[in-house]
């Protein structure tokens, strides 16, 4: 969490941002809130990106003002116009690109004063893994697949029964470049699997951590997946 205060003039307002991560090719949110004003027409929101010459986004007098928007953001940004009045200056960024990563500034002007806060935005690719029993293999084998990751993640297997065991000798992980030549498909195979055990396939890079669990018993197979973004710090 980053909390910024206005420094010019007699009055300052509190602006708060939260560091976040964007998934390449999907839509992302750059989060920013501020002390609300009673009149929408008195609120100005400017989003800036370090090293970028034009504006990322500008909202003033109740509407977008994008005449000086940087060419790399054309058609890709929007604020939540109906929520500005209650202090939400968050920016929706469409079709996130690798090059969108960097330091952004959320700059606010209201009738009460000015304020700004920075936000670190990471970009990459992350997806839920799915773990299945590989019935084509000669021995009991598990296959963990996740369609989109970037940068290249690490893959670690764990099991409930053999806690702390190192499965690197009995697993094989491969990374296959996807058609857009940036993200990769992750495939990890675990051999010599025993039944009545829960196995976890953990995929992690500096942006996200995802886990796919599979419980294999004689009568059933249960699966569960979850994903968490790393380093979501507020300012």
């Amino acid at each position: 969490l980053i909390i910024g205060f206005g420094i010019s003039g007699r009055h300052s307002i509190t602006v708060t941002t939260v560091a976040s991560a964007g998934n390449i090719g999907e839509d992302g949110i750059l989060s920013c809130t501020f002390e609300p004003d009673i009149k929408l027409s008195d609120i100005v929101i400017q989003w800036l990106k370090e090293g970028v010459l034009g504006l990322v986004h500008e909202f003033k007098e109740g509407k977008d003002e994008l005449s000086e928007q940087d060419e790399m953001f054309r058609g890709r940004t929007a604020v939540f116009a109906d929520q500005v009045i209650v202090g939400n200056a968050s920016l929706r960024l469409k079709n996130v690109q690798l090059t969108d990563a960097g330091t952004y500034k959320c700059y606010i002007i209201t009738s009460k004063g000015k304020g700004n806060a920075n936000l670190e935005y990471k970009t990459g690719a992350f997806s839920m893994p799915e773990v299945n029993v590989d019935y084509n293999a000669s021995s009991e084998t598990l296959r963990c697949e996740a369609p989109r990751w970037f940068p290249q993640p690490t893959v670690v297997w764990a099991s409930q029964v053999d806690q702390g065991a190192n499965f690197s000798e009995v697993s094989n992980t491969s990374f296959e470049l996807n058609s857009e030549n940036v993200t990769m498909k992750v495939v990890s195979v675990l051999y010599n699997v025993t039944i009545n055990n829960t196995y976890s396939c953990m995929i992690e890079n500096d942006i996200a951590k995802a886990t796919g669990d599979i419980k294999v018993t004689e009568s059933e197979i249960k699966r569960r997946s979850h994903l968490q973004l790393l380093n979501s710090k507020a300012s």
Epitope: G54, D64, E65, E71, R74, G75, A78, Q97, T99
Partner: antibody, heavy 120, light 113 residues
Framework: EVQLQQSGPDLVKPGASVKISCKAS????????IHWMKQSHGKSLEWIGR????????IYNQKFRGKAILTVDQSSNTAYMELRSLTSEASAVYYC?????????????WGQGTLVTVSA | DIVMTQSPSSLIVTAGEKVTMSCRSS????????????LTWFHQKPGRPPKLLIY???TRESGVPDRFTGSGSGTDFTLTISSVQTEDLAVYFC?????????FGSGTKLEEK
């Protein structure tokens, strides 16, 4: 007067690399993006990418990622494009262009072009 | 990527006549936030770099004669030369200026009868 002066023609062997320069004058170099285009003989134009002279950050057309490397040298007001692992398909005229506005395109000022010929 | 399609590929003209050429984009080039259509027109003569004529679909670049007019919105655009001159003989390109990667049409060649 805004001017972009590109380096002269180059004859290079397949598999080799070439580095084209684009020297800017008549304006504040760090204030405007520089873009690079490719024009094969008798064909249309392809956008290779842009570089921010302010910090050297490049953005590439996916098609040219890994083939073209865009850099700048602020001390000499010069933008560079290095083309790597050249094949005959890379034979073309390459242009640098400066945008009209500080925030971006259109491409208002163009270099005279640099002819690159890839041949054994 | 946005595909730009120009027609016709060539035009045989006589000095003084009115000329129109078309450019179509595979996606809309209109941006509601700036109320602009990010479509650019260039012309290019042999051995020369392209020259900017029209940007934002209808804004004439400084120094470009007023016989050149750009029109259209969304995905359909037109360049009109009200009274073509011999110095206008060139290849005309339209360009998607809206989103990366910027893309160009294949061109319309203006030739003398």
């Amino acid at each position: 007067e805004v001017q972009l002066q590109q380096s002269g023609p180059d004859l290079v062997k397949p598999g080799a690399s070439v580095k084209i320069s684009c020297k800017a004058s008549g304006y504040s170099f760090t204030g405007y993006y520089i873009h690079w285009m490719k024009q094969s003989h008798g064909k249309s134009l392809e956008w290779i990418g842009r570089v921010n002279p302010n910090n050297g950050d490049p953005i590439y057309n996916q098609k040219f990622r890994g083939k073209a490397i865009l850099t700048v040298d602020q001390s000499s007001n010069t933008a560079y494009m290095e083309l790597r692992s050249l094949t005959s398909e890379a034979s073309a005229v390459y242009y640098c262009a400066r945008v009209l506005f500080y925030y971006g395109s259109p491409f208002a000022y163009w270099g005279q072009g640099t002819l690159v010929t890839v041949s054994a | 990527d946005i595909v730009m399609t120009q027609s016709p590929s060539s035009l045989i003209v006589t000095a003084g006549e009115k000329v129109t050429m078309s450019c179509r984009s595979s996606q809309s080039l209109f941006d509601s936030g700036s109320q602009r259509n990010y479509l650019t027109w260039f012309h290019q003569k042999p051995g020369r770099p392209p020259k900017l004529l029209i940007y934002w679909a209808s804004t004439r670049e400084s120094g470009v004669p007023d016989r050149f007019t750009g029109s259209g919105s969304g995905t359909d655009f037109t360049l009109t030369i009200s009274s073509v001159q011999t110095e206008d003989l060139a290849v005309y390109f339209c360009q998607n200026d809206y989103s990366f990667p910027f893309t160009f049409g294949s061109g319309t060649k203006l030739e003398e009868k």
